[in-house]
Amino acid sequence: NKILVKQSPMLVAYDNAVNLSCKYSYNLFSREFRASLHKGLDSAVEVCVVYGNYSQQLQVYSKTGFNCDGKLGNESVTFYLQNLYVNQTDIYFCKIEVMYPPPYLDNEKSNGTIIHVKGKHLCPSPLFPGPSKP
């Protein structure tokens, strides 16, 4: 038995930020779950992970350098991605896993969301020269 996931087919990140909502056919209340967002057709990059536990507040991690946050609904997790680069335009897949207690449960692979990062090109800020000597 697999969980079904719904996500928008396309989102545009105008200011290098976007909210991606993952809606599940499963109530996460009172479950220990792991919601994650994966980049690329092969889902090779785990962008962001949200750990949920009925007795603790959400824990959000990215081990791949993304600036992300997460918000929990009864049957959804919304990922808020910031500081996206134009070259991070790609397809992103929601994944949900009920980790404990067993049996493990996860989702049918969704159709994904194409995130088109449009806005400003994020560049490292220029190094300002120090005060010039007289």
């Epitope: 792991r34 785990e46 992970v49 824990q59 896993e97 493990y104």
Partner: nanobody, 116 residues
């Protein structure tokens, strides 16, 4: 070829400690959640503990909570189970296994006997 090789079992007195290891090979260990499962003599399989792929989240059966600690070293492709305050009812064959995901691989197990 996927292999999971457990070690570290043995005979220990009640209240003692053991550390089990599971060496993984043949797959990208860091991408998979892992678990320890045990089977006591004449009984069914019991999930003991689960750790997620990043090693950031752990889960324990009530029977071992506060006594056992699961961990992993993705750079060494190794899963661990630190078992403290062992009891006679912890006597079992302990297996490491991939948890969830696309395939279901188990090791051959290591026997832990808790007896005075």
């Amino acid at each position: 070829e996927v292999q999971l090789l457990e070690s570290g079992g043995g005979l220990v007195q009640p209240g003692g400690s053991l550390r089990l290891s599971c060496a993984a090979s043949g797959f990208t260990f860091s991408r998979y959640h892992m678990a320890w499962v045990r089977q006591a003599p004449g009984k069914g399989l019991e999930w003991v503990s689960v750790i997620d792929s990043l090693g950031l989240q752990t889960y324990y059966a009530d029977s071992v909570k506060g006594r056992f600690t699961i961990s992993r070293d993705n750079s060494k492709n190794t899963l661990y189970l630190q078992m403290n305050s062992l009891r006679a009812e912890d006597t079992a064959v302990y297996y490491c296994a991939e948890y969830g995901g696309a395939f279901d691989y188990w090791g051959q197990g290591t026997l832990v006997t808790v007896s005075s």
